[in-house]
């Protein structure tokens, strides 16, 4: 009873949980659960029954496809959702969907830890600050990405005159959104207005 599918969505959005295959023909009952034992809704050939749960009032079941529509998902809705179908033969079949709800990333703030002019070179240490999020960082100098090994929350590099950039951008992203923050320097190595 495998059928595990992963879904990542942005918080506040409306989500459709469904399976890629068609439902067993003339099934007897269909149930959606979250966290393995909490029933959300059940359909039994006559009607859909919505149970007391945190989803009540913001879910809808389509008995034809088995799709479960959830409105305004929040991070607290992160869970493994299970669709269980009781077939006319008496057998059950299950499908699992692991739903990850992520907040859109906030706009990062670039903090200048250190700028130092060193014999025509510019030592630069910038940190990209966002509140406690698990995100990916990409640094750009005048829209050109820095090498992969420099891609984390702190950019620490020594620039030579031929590869000075005027503006430095930190892009933070997760699988549902991305935001940029930028600081600009005045050549050769001083802070300009953002």
């Amino acid at each position: 009873q495998g059928h595990l599918v992963h879904m990542t969505v942005v918080s506040g959005s409306n989500v459709t949980l469904n399976i890629s295959e068609s439902l067993p023909e003339n099934y007897k009952q269909l149930t959606w659960f979250y966290t393995f034992d909490q029933k959300i809704v059940e359909w039994d050939s006559r009607k859909s029954k919505y149970f007391e749960s945190k989803f009540k009032g913001r879910v809808r079941l389509d008995p034809q496809s088995g799709a479960l529509y959830i409105s305004k998902v929040q991070k607290e809705d992160n869970s493994t959702y299970i669709m269980r179908v009781l077939k006319k033969t008496g057998n059950e079949q299950e499908w699992k969907i692991k739903l990850q709800v992520l907040d859109p990333v906030p706009k990062p703030v670039i903090k200048i830890e250190k700028i130092e002019d060193m014999d025509d070179n510019c030592y630069l240490k910038l940190s990209c600050v966002i509140p406690g999020e698990s995100v990916n960082y990409t640094w750009y100098g005048d829209k050109r990405p820095f090498p992969k090994e420099l891609q984390n929350s702190v950019l620490e590099t020594t620039l030579m005159p031929h590869n000075y950039s005027r503006c430095y951008t930190c892009q933070v992203s997760n699988s549902v959104s991305s935001k940029n923050g930028t600081v600009c320097l005045s050549p050769p190595c001083t802070l300009a207005r953002s």
């Epitope: 029933k39 149970f51 057998n91």
Partner: antibody, heavy 121, light 107 residues
Amino acid sequence: QVQLVQSGAEVKKPGAAVKVSCKASGYTFTAYGISWVRQAPGQGLEWMGWISAYDGDTNNAQKFQGRVTMTTDTSSSTAYMELRSLGSDDTAVYYCARDRYSSSSGYFDYWGQGTLVTVSS
Amino acid sequence: DIQMTQSPSSVSASVGDRVTITCRASQDISSWLAWSQQKPGKAPKALIYAASSLQSGVPSRFSGSGSGTDFTLTISSLQPEDFATYYCQQANSFPYTFGQGTKLEIK
């Protein structure tokens, strides 16, 4: 964890009625059905009927038709089974059992501990 | 009503043995069959549903098979706690009916 706790043993006179309760905990009561099954001393299991805790829909075995009433109280997550016009052959242990579905599938996943009902003059 | 017939009525076996209990329905019930275990003075405990699906928490030494009218419950290697009475039950149609039980005793 899921628990079905039944009321205590009863001794009844022939012709009387008995009402057995089954208090559920550890799950959303209305999301499952409850069946009632009895077992006479030294005998096998006999299904009496089923009730949906969601909407009170019932189905009783023909043998008990007109003599058994199954109800639920969702506010206390309790199912009840009342059996009337008791005879000595109704002496048995009465069990409640949770159905895997809110509409009866006939698959019972949890059982109460049983209530002994003795009918004796 | 659908009649359920179990065989044998009782069986003696030793710890470590493989035991098979059979159940026959009086008409085709597809896979609508459950097995339960009952120890003296205790409530039944669900073992198998849908002929072959193991209830949550039940050891994997228990297995069920069959469809239509003939079904089997197999205990692959008997443990001391497995000595009990086993019932099959059809869930195909109302009224749900049970087999008469198979008592598994220590040899």
